[in-house]
Interface confidence: low
């Protein structure tokens, strides 16, 4: 067991937020400004984020975690980590890559991102058209004759938006 | 009413350049840090680099930071862009913004214009 001990690697007892330093006989020493180390025993530590440019930061950068960065108001992340920041658009349009473009008759976005998507087709479920539909909301489905029995729910209520970050980009 | 709007762009070789322009009208151009940002093919938008009102303060994004300068010319109303050593991750869409003049330097911008595409291919 000693023997095992004294063939340990030194620099597997770094904490993390400190670097394993080679040019100090293998001392732990900390990891510099605006650096960080997560995990104990690391050689370097990592160059933290930095949230520039249409990127925010959402938590400092600190000597055991990396820098978290959001989108400036106006925009919204994608990718992991929130790799890239897109444009916000209003209700009731779509980012193209022409910008901004309101959604087309027939389909809707209760969203300031994601896609235009279609109006329910009531009569499919053998519904009418309760209320129409806009750029900005579904269209509510009104009861099928069926649904007017004493007892029933007269109106079907549209359809729960998707999450944010579900809708397809 | 603002108005904003690029040109310059076009087909260039890798290594080629190029200059963008973005004319400003229906405002006090020389009130306003402006700024370039672009959105590559199916990608999010980038902020590429900005300067102050009077083009004493500039930045860059580190992917364009030695290649790209920012100008402008306050008594012409314009904003310009010089690309230098293009690539081919350079071809984007790139749109000149006007920052919201509450916050300037802050990158939360409040009028785009319509963009013009660079891209980069030999």
């Known amino acids: 067991f000693e023997r095992t001990r004294s063939l340990q690697d030194p620099c597997s007892n770094c904490p993390a937020g400190t670097f394993c330093d080679n040019n100090r006989n293998q001392i732990c020493s900390p990891c510099p400004p605006n650096s960080f180390s997560s995990a104990g025993g690391q050689r370097t530590c990592d160059i933290c984020r930095q949230c520039k440019g249409v990127f925010r930061t959402r938590k400092e950068c600190s000597s055991t975690s990396n820098a978290e960065c959001d989108c400036t108001p106006g925009f919204h992340c994608l990718g992991a980590g929130c790799s890239m920041c897109e444009q916000d658009c209003k209700q009731g349009q779509e980012l193209t890559k022409k910008g901004c473009k309101d959604c087309c008759f027939g389909t809707f976005n209760d969203q300031k991102r994601g896609i235009c998507r279609p109006w329910t087709n009531c009569s499919l479920d053998g519904k009418s058209v309760l209320v129409n539909g806009t750029k900005e909301r579904d269209v509510v489905c009104g009861p099928s004759p069926a649904d007017l029995s004493p007892g029933a729910s007269s109106v079907t209520p549209p359809a729960p938006a998707r999450e944010p970050g579900h809708s397809p980009q | 009413e603002v108005q904003l709007v690029e040109s310059g762009g076009g087909l260039v070789k890798p290594g080629g350049s190029l200059r963008l322009s973005c004319a400003a009208s229906?405002?006090?151009?020389?009130?306003?840090?402006m700024s370039w940002i672009r959105q590559a093919p199916g990608k999010g938008l980038e902020w590429v680099s900005h300067?102050?009102?009077?083009?004493?303060?500039?930045d860059y994004a580190d992917s364009v930071k030695g290649r790209f300068t920012i100008s402008r010319d306050n008594a012409k109303n314009s904003l310009y862009l010089q690309m230098n050593s293009l690539r081919a991750e350079d071809t984007a869409v790139y749109y000149c913004?006007?920052?919201?003049?509450?916050?300037?330097?802050?990158?939360?911008?409040?009028?785009w214009g319509q963009g013009t595409l660079v891209t980069v291919s030999s």
């Open positions: 913004a006007r920052e919201d003049p509450r916050m300037p330097g802050t990158f939360d911008f409040d009028n």
């Open positions: 229906g405002f006090t151009f020389s009130d306003y840090y």
């Open positions: 300067i102050s009102s009077s083009g004493s303060t500039i």
